[in-house]
Amino acid sequence: RKAVLDCEAMKTNEFPSPCLDSKTKVVMKGQNVSMFCSHKNKSLQITYSLFRRKTHLGTQDGKGEPAIFNLSITEAHESGPYKCKAQVTSCSKYSRDFSFTIVDPVTSPVLNIMVIQTETDRHITLHCLSVNGSLPINYTFFENHVAISPAISKYDREPAEFNLTKKNPGEEEEYRCEAKNRLPNYATYSHPVTMPSTGGDSCPFCLK
């Protein structure tokens, strides 16, 4: 009789579909993730099951608290889609699909500098390229640890370019670039390149 009542409750939307979520939607291969399956009904003892496509990954019981499923995303096919099933006695509802986006992390970019020296100015062209990592990649250029460019988005495996003109400086400057894609909290930096303070022969990047 209880099962019938629970199913009747479902018909009147007192037992809606569960919600499946994760704090991280963009992941890299080998990353551990937690998936949370929760239900609006906090008074029922609910059995939660997690599926990737039709493969059953695990089952947990809960009441009032979300079920937490810990997974490791090691292969592309493990991106999803995932669904969570909430079951009370013989009655069940499934969540909407949840899929991860698997992104390859960017490798440390290489910064190249080209300079055209005039009597009064240096026309500097900075090139930055990360040869590995999922596109798009956002590049930002720094001078003495201060950002001097906006984020430059590259949707192909071509270097980002940034031009600047400087009065012949009195002191040396250090340049580097940052590469970042959709992976949160994951950025890489190039080795710094130092520009000497005076022109002439001490300008190794200058076009003569």
Epitope: A3, C7, M10, K11, S49, F51, R53, K54, T55, H56, E75, A76, H77, P81, K83, K85, S90, C91, S92, K93, Y94, D97
Partner: antibody, heavy 123, light 112 residues
């Protein structure tokens, strides 16, 4: 035209083995489906045997009664799915259908069927 | 096992009649609505009519409709046409420790 064509059926003695093939045309296996086998004994209802996912891992799903004697495999390069049947019994006599469904957990229904191939187990 | 029980097992009807077939599951199907209906004509493969208890499959005439949830489901043909004389099967799906895809025993719709 999208179609599934089964082959390999015929007469087999009890205890024997048979391998059925299902060739899919107009379907790109890389689009990822479950390719399934369903059988129907003469004058009886339909009975699900199992499915294989056409994606990289090729997850398998079997009816509990079919585990052990029945094996589903695939060759994605040929867009073909196979059903290996061992230790056949008279009650395995049926028309064997190849059927397709989506790969999601909620894709439980079969939306494309082959014409079927008859397997007769008799001495 | 899930047992799917259809009734009636056969019926006789005339063109234009309203026909109702029921399907009862021994336990609730998954998601409360994972039930499909198929039509099969002699010597032919089944054809999907309805899924998710009430969603019409592509290309299926609107005279077919489905309803129900949990354990009790109904297929209705609002006005029977000559091409509708066939056998109809329900299919329920459920996951326990394995997937179950259970078919009903069929309902044969014959000409009166």
């Amino acid at each position: 035209e999208v179609q599934l064509v089964e082959s390999g059926g015929g007469l087999v003695q009890p205890g024997g083995s048979l391998r059925l093939s299902c060739a899919a045309s107009g379907i790109d296996f890389s689009s990822y489906y479950d390719m399934c086998w369903v059988r129907q004994a003469p004058g009886k209802c339909l009975e699900w045997i199992g499915c294989i996912y056409t994606g990289s891992v090729g997850e398998l799903y079997y009816a509990s009664w079919a585990k052990g004697r029945f094996t589903i495999s695939r060759d994605n390069s040929k867009n073909t799915v196979y059903l290996q049947m061992n230790s056949l019994r008279a009650e395995d006599t049926a028309v064997y259908y190849c059927a397709r469904r989506g790969s999601g957990v909620d894709d439980y229904y079969f939306n494309l069927w082959g014409q079927g191939t008859l397997v007769t187990v008799s001495s | 096992d899930i047992q799917m029980t259809q009734s009636p097992s056969s019926l006789s009807a005339s063109v234009g009649d309203r026909v109702t077939i029921t399907c009862q599951s021994s336990q609730s199907v998954d998601n409360n609505n994972w039930l499909a209906w198929y039509q099969q004509k002699p010597g032919k493969a089944p054809k999907l009519l309805i899924y998710d208890a009430s969603t019409l499959a592509s290309g299926v005439p609107s005279r077919f409709s489905g309803s129900g949830s949990g354990t009790d489901f109904t297929l209705t043909i609002s006005s029977l046409q000559p091409e509708d004389f066939a056998t109809y099967y329900c299919q329920g799906t459920y996951y326990t420790t394995d997937w179950w895809n259970s078919f009903g025993q069929g309902t044969k719709v014959e000409i009166k």
